[in-house]
């Protein structure tokens, strides 16, 4: 039950995260005009990954796409690439995780297959989240660098005597959406990976009979050791009980989410 909940929650969190990454990638407000030096501007500039926009005093907003690939800064191209890779990986991860969900039955799919798929989607979500966080962080770093550069050259002479203030840009809403969405996708991926360990199937469990030797509290169990599944090998040689004869210490021996550490 706990495994299903962890897997389901991981899926939902990742879904929200990927939706956020898509939203952030499409948003126009990656950078917005810094109003500190010109709070009374009637013309407000903001830029996204795909186009730049200007809101005028009339309330009219005009956006113009970046109709060039070669003329764009390499960093912007890198951010675009990271966000797209994040979306693609996230989308594939979502597709895989839908089939991996424990609550969904597809034919006679083995638990081991579901476990593998859960792990795969989890890793995809983690990489997707990291791509988004990296993309947003690279863009933020680019903004900070440009901000201080333009502050240093705040006043550029125009026509000799007249001074014109250079437009500076600061963090836009899309950056915060991207950071949060990337984080959620990452958390969702980790949850999927955790859930995967609980989905790992056990080999045939024989009904165990406990034999009590006088003066000893050792329970003998033929074939009672958990076989390694590849997902969190059983290094502790825990005994598996399957409702057979019970010992006094069996109360603490039921398999639980803590058994797969």
């Amino acid at each position: 039950m706990a495994v299903t909940a962890c897997q389901g929650l991981g899926f939902v969190v990742s879904l929200i995260g990927i939706a956020g990454i898509i939203a952030a990638t499409c948003m126009d407000q990656w950078s917005t005009q810094d109003l500190y030096n010109n709070p009374v501007t009637a013309v407000f500039n903001y830029q996204g990954l795909w186009r730049s926009c200007v809101r005028e005093s009339s309330g009219f907003t005009e956006c113009r796409g970046y109709f060039t690939l070669l003329g764009l800064p390499a960093m912007l191209q890198a951010v675009r690439a990271l966000m797209i890779v994040g979306i693609v990986l996230g989308a594939i991860g979502l597709l895989v995780s839908i089939f991996a969900l424990k609550c969904i039955r597809i034919g006679s799919m083995e638990d081991s297959a579901k476990a593998n798929m859960t792990l795969t989607s989890g890793i995809m979500f983690i990489v997707s989240g990291l791509c988004a966080i990296a993309g947003v962080s690279v863009f933020a770093n680019m903004l900070v660098t440009n901000f201080w550069m333009s502050t240093a050259n705040m006043y550029t002479g125009m026509g000799g005597m007249v001074q014109t203030v250079q437009t500076r840009y600061t963090f836009g809403a899309a950056l915060f959406v991207g950071w949060v969405a990337g984080g959620l996708t990452l958390i969702g991926g980790v949850m999927m990976c955790i859930a995967c360990r609980g989905l790992a199937p056990e080999e045939t469990n024989y009904k165990a009979v406990s034999y009590h030797a006088s003066g000893h509290s050792v329970a003998y169990k033929p074939g009672g050791f958990k076989a390694s599944t590849g997902f969190g090998s059983n290094t502790k040689n825990k005994k598996i009980y399957d409702g057979g004869a019970r010992t006094e210490d069996e109360v603490q021996s039921y398999p639980s989410k803590h058994d797969y550490v």
Epitope: Q33, N38, V40, T41, A42, V43, N45, Q47, S52, V54, E56, S57, S58, G59, F60, E62, R64, M158, V162, Q163, T164, V165, Q166, T167
Partner: antibody, heavy 115, light 113 residues
Framework: QVQLVQSGAEVKKPGASVKVSCKAS????????IHWVKQAPGQGLEWMGY????????NYNLKFKDRVTLTSDTSISTAYMELSRLRSDDTAVYYC????????WGQGTLVTVSS | DIVMTQSPDSLAVSLGERATINCKSS????????????LIWYQQKPGQPPKLLIY???TRDSGVPDRFSGSGSGTDFTLTISSLQAEDVAVYYC?????????FGGGTKLEIK
């Protein structure tokens, strides 16, 4: 076509208030800011401020800020300009304007302040 | 506040001749975000509201005859009427559309010589 129709002329006493309306039609009222401009007799144009019907935001010329209130009613696509504590130098034609580059203007409302 | 200074205050030009009105702003009206200058030109005839002629310093509004043209950048702008017509007699205003409060020039009265 885009139209801005303003309320009729007003005669007020000093110290009173006046509320001028501007009814918009032919465009999405919430998409553009409605600006108000004052023109005293034989004088030039003076920007008073704007109201953004979409979000209720506004911006005022500091010269008028303490006496002017700009509001809008999106249900009837109408913007209002209320000027309080009227003085004789408030006698002027008041225009509402909207659109890119103030492409559309109301016909103007003459407010006369006289004792 | 940005101060808009128009010159001359009045201008008399013969029909068919070129008329030039200048406008100077105390600060640049150039927006680096889209490389445009935020200056507007209006024409106002007696008893009428102003009529938009030019926005963004050089973009003619729809329906405005092509004899009207705007030019300039930064702080210096010009409205040119290439061939004056009788119906062009009016007062012309320039306006800062870049920074609040939006400010207007004092106006230039254009007459026929």
């Amino acid at each position: 076509q885009v139209q801005l129709v303003q309320s009729g002329a007003e005669v007020k006493k000093p110290g009173a208030s006046v509320k001028v309306s501007c009814k918009a039609s032919g465009f999405t009222f919430t998409s553009y800011n409605i600006h108000w401009v004052k023109q005293a007799p034989g004088q030039g144009l003076e920007w008073m401020g704007y109201i953004s019907p979409g979000n209720g935001g506004s911006n005022y010329n500091l010269k008028f800020k303490d006496r002017v209130t700009l509001t809008s009613d999106t249900s009837i696509s109408t913007a209002y300009m209320e000027l309080s504590r009227l003085r004789s130098d408030d006698t002027a034609v008041y225009y509402c304007a909207t659109g890119r580059g103030f492409a559309y203007w109301g016909q103007g409302t003459l407010v006369t302040v006289s004792s | 506040d940005i101060v808009m200074t128009q010159s001359p205050d009045s201008l008399a030009v013969s029909l068919g001749e070129r008329a030039t009105i200048n406008c100077k702003s105390s600060q640049s009206l150039f927006n680096s975000g889209n490389q445009k200058n935020y200056l507007i030109w209006y024409q106002q005839k007696p008893g009428q509201p102003p009529k938009l002629l030019i926005y963004r310093a050089s973009t003619r509004d729809s329906g405005v005859p092509d004899r009207f043209s705007g030019s300039g950048s930064g702080t210096d702008f010009t409205l040119t009427i290439s061939s004056l017509q009788a119906e062009d007699v009016a007062v012309y205003y320039c306006q800062n559309d870049y920074s609040y409060p939006l400010t207007f020039g004092g106006g230039t009265k254009l007459e026929i010589k």
